[in-house]
Amino acid sequence: SGTTNTVAAYNLTWKSTNFKTILEWEPKPVNQVYTVQISTKSGDWKSKCFYTTDTECDLTDEIVKDVKQTYLARVFSYPAGNVESTGSAGEPLYENSPEFTPYLETNLGQPTIQSFEQVGTKVNVTVEDERTLVRRNNTFLSLRDVFGKDLIYTLYYWKSSSSGKKTAKTNTNEFLIDVDKGENYCFSVQAVIPSRTVNRKSTDSPVECMGQEKGEFREI
């Protein structure tokens, strides 16, 4: 049951990258407004985005409290200008979201190669440890802080003159690879959480090549 002239939200979808988490839904409101509630499976409902005409609600502040919990959200529909009005059953119309477990489901953001340094026939490639909105002791945690060894990086590297991509993997943020002397190489990295079955990989980082500013070359 619901309120006269209101329609229930539908297509409730979680959009989450590196724990920045937004709930989206349809339809665009016509003469109605929405309020979102979120809760863990065992917790109380908390209201967010009160009486909004938006069709999205940023729930990051709630989910970062415990990224390993499973969350459920619901979107209530109210007639515009009459938000106290309820349906015949005494409650507004609402729709439930799918369950969402941030640790297992947040998309991995595009990584960035912070630097690379060549010493002789070795190159050290460092991946930027991106900050998330997850907090511990009033400090924002990095992606590595949150995922620990569950997060790995795959490095793709290739001679500028060739197309075949070699790979290396690390469960830190650094790679040490062997290269041929006198050859220029290009690099791209991908974040991966191998223990997942879905949303396992990030998009690739921008390609960085030797001979550009980010790198440093030392002949030993």
């Epitope: 790995i152 795959t154 793709y156 070699k166 690879i177 191998p194 879905v198 396992r200 990989k201």
Partner: antibody
Framework: EVQLVESGGGLVQPGGSLRLSCAAS????????IHWVRQAPGKGLEWVGY????????YHADSVKGRFTISADTSKNTAYLQMNSLRAEDTAVYYC?????????????WGQGTLVTVSS | DIQMTQSPSSLSASVGDRVTITCRAS??????VAWYQQKPGKAPKLLIY???FLYSGVPSRFSGSRSGTDFTLTISSLQPEDFATYYC?????????FGQGTKVEIK
């Protein structure tokens, strides 16, 4: 259930071409990398190459470079091995295998293999 | 490319025997070594990954160890179904390479 099924093998003359398919089910290939490994009759395992379907990156073994090309169609959840300029020494059972891309990643699932015979 | 030198190429053993197969990497591969079992006409099956970790569903009589660039697969008590060919593989760097294989036959 995770499954890899190779097809497309057969008898081909030296210098000929063949395209092998590796159809995946139970997982999405773009979340993994797919490798091709071959085994000549009575011999050991030889790595042929890989593709990361999420970005199209590939690498081929020196023994097949310039003759074989690995590709993937994520909409069909299938990887391919295009083999040109085939030689007698390419005669083998060809396997595709899934790489979970962990630091310790071995090939956790393999197809049943498809036999390619290069002979006149 | 990294070479994986596997020995012996074949061995004969009886049910209940302890069997050891070794692989030596031509350079450091950290712990990025796997062991596979292959039976005639079948695809290889993963036994051990990361040098010493037992893959899901593999009997505990199989174990792996590492000492520097030397890697060992041990079958503590050979069973009838263990007669097969075993391969080591390094996946530390591209291209991944396999050992030549060890055929375990019935004595």
């Amino acid at each position: 259930e995770v499954q890899l099924v190779e097809s497309g093998g057969g008898l081909v003359q030296p210098g000929g071409s063949l395209r092998l398919s590796c159809a995946a089910s139970g997982f999405t290939i773009s979340d993994y990398t797919i490798h091709w490994v071959r085994q000549a009759p009575g011999k050991g395992l030889e790595w042929v190459g890989y593709i990361d379907p999420s970005n199209g990156y590939t690498y081929h073994a020196d023994s097949v470079k310039g003759r074989f090309t690995i590709s993937a169609d994520t909409s069909k959840n299938t990887a391919y091995l295009q083999m040109n300029s085939l030689r007698a020494e390419d005669t083998a059972v060809y396997y595709c295998a899934r790489d979970p891309q962990s630091v310790s990643s071995p090939f956790d699932y393999w197809g049943q293999g498809t036999l390619v015979t290069v002979s006149s | 490319d990294i070479q994986m030198t596997q020995s012996p190429s074949s061995l004969s053993a009886s049910v209940g025997d302890r069997v050891t197969i070794t692989c030596r990497a031509s350079q450091d591969v950290n712990t990025a070594v796997a062991w596979y079992q292959q039976k005639p006409g079948k695809a290889p099956k993963l036994l051990i990954y990361s040098a010493s970790f037992l893959y899901s569903g593999v009997p505990s009589r199989f174990s792996g160890s590492r000492s520097g660039t030397d890697f060992t697969l041990t079958i503590s008590s050979l069973q009838p179904e263990d007669f097969a060919t075993y391969y080591c593989q390094q996946h530390y760097t591209t291209p991944p390479t396999f050992g030549q294989g060890t055929k375990v036959e019935i004595k």
